[in-house]
């Protein structure tokens, strides 16, 4: 398996009750607006063929996509949560900027691409779904990167 380097976040990032609560509130509010319950973006298949030690790098890719292609374009919605959660997630993304894996990451890019394609195919409802799964993104980042 490729070796991951600098793929670590301090546990304290996930031990801030206020921003954790706001992230989960944002996810809950968006999930109420998500009428497509058959599709799951962050689930088992996202990690198919990806070893546990590579998953922080994978989640970094998912986080960056979510910020750039979902949260920034939808930043005027789901206030006041969005204006607090987006900077928090952006800081996590910045802290993972040096997270890379040495070697082939095609299997990871393939899984991330499937998630991207699903969001794009669903259009705005895909973006709402991604926001509704920010709790899963948060928990997966915590599990993968601490």
């Amino acid at each position: 398996a490729p070796i991951s380097s600098h793929c670590r976040l301090d546990k304290s990032n996930f031990q801030q009750p206020y921003i954790t609560n706001r992230t989960f509130m944002l996810a809950k509010e968006a999930s109420l607006a998500d009428n497509n319950t058959d599709v799951r973006l962050i689930g088992e298949k996202l990690f198919h063929g990806v070893s546990m030690s590579e998953r922080c790098y994978l989640m970094k890719q998912v986080l960056n996509f979510t910020l750039e292609e979902v949260l920034f374009p939808q930043s005027d919605r789901f206030q006041p949560y969005m204006q607090e959660v987006v900077p928090f997630l952006a800081r996590l993304s910045n802290r993972l900027s040096t997270c890379h894996i040495e070697g082939d990451d095609l299997h990871i890019q393939r899984n991330v691409q499937k998630l991207k394609d699903t969001v794009k195919k669903l259009g705005e409802s895909g973006e709402i779904k991604a926001i509704g799964e920010l709790d899963l993104l948060f928990m997966s980042l915590r599990n993968a990167c601490i």
Partner: antibody, heavy 120, light 107 residues
Framework: EVQLQESGPGLVKPSQTLSLTCTVS????????VHWVRQHSGKGLEWMGR???????SYNTAFTSRLTISRDTSKSQVSLKLSSVTAADTAVYYC??????????????WGQGTTVTVSS | DIVMTQSPSSVSASVGDRVTITCKAS??????LAWYQQKPGKANKLLIY???TLQSGTPSRFSGSGSSTDFTLTISSLQPEDFATYYC?????????FGQGTKLEIK
């Protein structure tokens, strides 16, 4: 309460196919993976394969050519079929559920196991 | 495949003793090691995963430590119900592999 129960014939003849069923309750097969693990008498545990929550399968390459894992979600059952068995396949066979979607390779809940003997 | 080597294969101890079991991986598995307890006639029980995370319901006398290739399971004060066989498992990559087990017996 999460429960898994293995069932199947306790005796199989050499060269035949071993067929086992894992019946689950307390969770949905479309939400969690189910793994098969076996244990030879007095020995360690050996991972055989996995049924993913979406119906895909993954196998230990040691068994790939003769192992098939399938499921029937309406009956909450996952099946294991191991073909061309020999005495070396005599073991206790377990099914186990993954912890969650992230810790999918951690086996959080196990059945009690069913003993299979391969003998003529 | 990653080979998991447990030691000792058996250990005798008394109630109240502190017991340590070790597990060594043939290549790095980061922190991704699980410990299971096996008792005759009972379903196997997940105790610890990710090296040190206690599964819900695992008593606090159990603890796990280690990373990369070397890991330990410690029982701080043995209770009568702890006499069993313990297995380590790497849950980093496929195929999932287990140690050969450590039998904890009453002295």
């Amino acid at each position: 309460e999460v429960q898994l129960q293995e069932s199947g014939p306790g005796l199989v003849k050499p060269s035949q196919t071993l067929s086992l069923t894992c019946t689950v309750s307390g969770f949905s097969l479309t939400s969690y993976s189910v793994h098969w693990v076996r244990q030879h008498s007095g020995k360690g545990l050996e991972w055989m394969g996995r049924m993913w929550s979406d119906g895909d399968t993954s196998y230990n390459t040691a068994f790939t050519s003769r192992l098939t894992i399938s499921r029937d979600t309406s009956k909450s059952q996952v099946s294991l079929k191991l073909s061309s068995v020999t005495a070396a396949d005599t073991a206790v066979y377990y099914c186990a559920r993954s912890l969650d979607f992230y810790y999918d390779t951690t086996l959080a809940f196990w059945g009690q196991g069913t003993t299979v003997t391969v003998s003529s | 495949d990653i080979v998991m080597t447990q030691s000792p294969s058996s250990v005798s101890a008394s109630v109240g003793d502190r017991v340590t079991i070790t597990c060594k991986a043939s290549k790095t598995i980061s922190k991704y090691l699980a410990w299971y307890q096996q008792k005759p006639g009972k379903a196997n029980k997940l105790l610890i995963y990710s090296g040190s995370t206690l599964q819900s319901g695992t008593p606090s006398r159990f603890s796990g430590s280690g990373s990369s290739t070397d890991f330990t399971l410690t029982i701080s004060s043995l209770q009568p119900e702890d006499f069993a066989t313990y297995y380590c498992q790497q849950h980093n990559e496929y195929p999932l592999t287990f140690g050969q087990g450590t039998k904890l017996e009453i002295k």
